[in-house]
Amino acid sequence: EEELQVIQPEKSVSVAAGDSATLNCTVSSLIPVGPIQWFRGAGPGRELIYNLKEGHFPRVTPVSDPTKRNNMDFSIRISNITPADAGTYYCVKFRKGSPDVELKSGAGTELSVRAKPS
């Protein structure tokens, strides 16, 4: 049985302040059952960036249609980037449970923010 892979193809992404950043993530399998969440940073202090089920993330939208069947693309787009958004973003697969259990993280994508061209 092949192990699930969480693939973040870009090690780094550079975006001008005010633009949108696309952070790519795909998974290799629909199972195990459980959600994908995005975080900035690692460890216990990490910041939740996107979780479709809970919270309000007005600047974050999924790249692919959230109603698409059996889709394995969990890329997100963050709008109106500011220098405060810089950091390393992780796409994380959870196994469904009570509570959900972290199963595997992508390697991370470092977002750097360039000054807005004058």
Epitope: L30, I31, P32, V33, K53, P66, T67, K68, D73, K96
Partner: antibody, heavy 120, light 108 residues
Framework: EVQLLESGGGVVQPGGSLRLSCAAS????????VTWVRQAPGKGLEWVST??????YYADSVKGRFTISRDNSKNTLYLQMNSLRAEDTAVYYC???????????????WGQGTLVTVSS | EIVLTQSPATLSVSPGERATLSCRAS??????LAWYQQKPGQAPRLLIY???IRETGIPARFSGSGSGTEFTLTISSLQSEDFAVYYC??????????FGGGTKVEIK
């Protein structure tokens, strides 16, 4: 064409055991979660159990008595039912899960069901 | 556990008329709701998922609407083959997946 074919139903005494099978074809079985749903005579649908890869989920009403498993090499889903009770009498359907990417699962293909009757 | 309440339990409709079926969730399920049709002696068949998206091959007379806690399945002009029992199912918060008690659509 997706097909799901259940077998193994029958009449069993209370406290007895039964093993249901569901043979799947027409899709990449190992890539999808699969589920058992049952329907008591004249009643509505009741979710029983779901299996992903190693992950398994059960309704409280069957937890500790039923075990779901799969054999991807045989494209087959199983439900081992122990300590059966009269209230387990139902048609048992296997169903293929379909997922909306950021969300949960629903059931896009169903077998025709197999009847389990628990009676002395 | 999220409880789904379907109403009415039975709906008597003449062929060609419109049928409106309701499904109410005990808590917010966003759009994570499916509708199934079941005819006597047959397995359920998926009609609608994500509250409003018709499954491939389902006629356009079937439509789903609603979000949060209130959902509706509408059959715009009932055909003879549409007389059946209809179930809603939530997949927002599980286990357990839960189904409504069903609405039987019968010929008036």
């Amino acid at each position: 064409e997706v097909q799901l074919l259940e077998s193994g139903g029958g009449v069993v005494q209370p406290g007895g055991s039964l093993r249901l099978s569901c043979a799947a074809s027409g899709f990449s079985f190992s890539n999808f979660a699969v589920t058992w749903v049952r329907q008591a005579p004249g009643k509505g649908l009741e979710w029983v159990s779901t299996i992903g890869s190693g992950d398994t989920y059960y309704a409280d009403s069957v937890k500790g008595r039923f075990t779901i498993s799969r054999d991807n090499s045989k494209n087959t889903l199983y439900l081992q039912m122990n300590s059966l009770r009269a209230e387990d009498t139902a048609v048992y359907y296997c169903a293929k899960d379909s997922t909306v990417s950021w969300s949960g699962d629903f059931f896009d293909y169903w077998g025709q069901g197999t009847l389990v009757t628990v009676s002395s | 556990e999220i409880v789904l309440t379907q109403s009415p339990a039975t709906l008597s409709v003449s062929p060609g008329e419109r049928a409106t079926l309701s499904c109410r969730a005990s808590q917010n399920v966003k759009n994570d709701l499916a509708w199934y049709q079941q005819k006597p002696g047959q397995a359920p068949r998926l009609l609608i998922y994500a509250a409003r998206i018709r499954e491939t091959g389902i006629p356009a007379r079937f439509s789903g609407s609603g979000s949060g806690t209130e959902f509706t399945l509408t059959i715009s002009s009932l055909q003879s083959e549409d007389f059946a029992v209809y179930y809603c199912q939530q997949y927002y918060d599980w286990p357990p997946f839960t189904f409504g008690g069903g609405t039987k659509v019968e010929i008036k």
